[in-house]
């Protein structure tokens, strides 16, 4: 529970409680920002990127966005509260346990973007159509 | 009853050094995950740092990769985090926070200790 010597600020995102006052803890992501990628038709990919950061929010989300254009492909992973957009989209599948790329329309490149809600699932990158489908079997195991 | 109780706080210069701890009472300490937190003046809450039961993995906030470093000693049921290369922005009071068990609930805190970067 929040102690109360802990002092609320007048707009604190920071603090994030359930039902019984307990603290919530931000998700774990990996957070490389924008590295080169070496990710190419492959059905999923690993980031490659060694830093796991915790989220400076505890509503905040793991992002990746992979993108390619005549020059190199690049693949971004942080973290990011699915209330605001990102490179101009929503979030939608915030809530997935997976990251499952979807393709957004952007001019002059091919652009890929997932966000997830497991701890560091922006680690593992999945094109694959056969992940695109709702499937009940896949439980958000958070952080336990 | 579980207790925490945080010492190591004061004074310090920017570049300077401290190390705070945090005892333990009252729980099985080496079964749950810990945290360190902190709340800057007029400011919200930052989770700084994480550790698991047994010590590793540790996780870091951006703002002190690379600077901080959390450690527990479980057959001394106590927490640590040395903190280098301080900066004004680091000046808060810090928090010891245990896990529940469940999600990712923190439910006890401690009452905390004063850091203050200033020259």
């Known amino acids: 529970t929040i102690p109360p010597h802990v002092q609320k600020s007048v707009n604190n995102d920071m603090i994030v409680t359930d039902n019984n006052g307990a603290v919530k803890f931000p998700q774990l992501c990996k957070f490389c920002d924008v590295r080169f990628s070496t990710c190419d038709n492959q059905k999923s990919c690993m980031s490659n990127c060694s830093i796991t950061s915790i989220c400076e929010k505890p509503q905040e989300v793991c992002v990746a966005v992979w993108r390619k254009n005549d020059e190199n492909i690049t693949l971004e992973t942080v973290c990011h509260d699915p209330k605001l957009p990102y490179h101009d989209f929503i979030l939608e599948d915030a809530a997935s346990p997976k990251c499952i790329m979807k393709e957004k329309k952007k001019p002059g490149e091919t652009f890929f973007m997932c966000s997830c809600s497991s701890d560091e699932c922006n680690d593992n990158i999945i094109f694959s159509e056969e992940y695109n489908t709702s499937n009940p079997d896949l439980l958000l195991v958070i952080f336990q | 009853e579980v207790q925490l109780l945080e010492s190591g706080g004061g004074l310090v210069q920017p570049g300077g050094s401290l190390r705070l701890s945090c005892a333990a009472s009252g729980f099985t300490f080496d079964k749950y995950k810990m945290a360190w937190v902190r709340q800057a003046p007029g400011k919200g809450l930052e989770w700084v740092s994480l550790?698991?039961?047994?010590?590793?993995?540790?996780y870091y906030a951006n703002s002190v990769k690379g600077r901080f470093t959390i450690s527990r000693d479980n057959s001394k049921n106590t927490l640590y985090l040395q903190m280098n290369s301080l900066r004004a922005e680091d000046t808060a009071v810090y928090y010891c926070?245990?896990?529940?068990?469940?999600?990712?609930?923190?439910?006890?805190w401690g009452q905390g200790t004063l850091v203050t970067v200033s020259s």
């Open positions: 926070a245990k896990y529940s068990g469940q999600g990712r609930d923190f439910d006890y």
């Open positions: 550790i698991f039961p047994n010590g590793v993995p540790t």
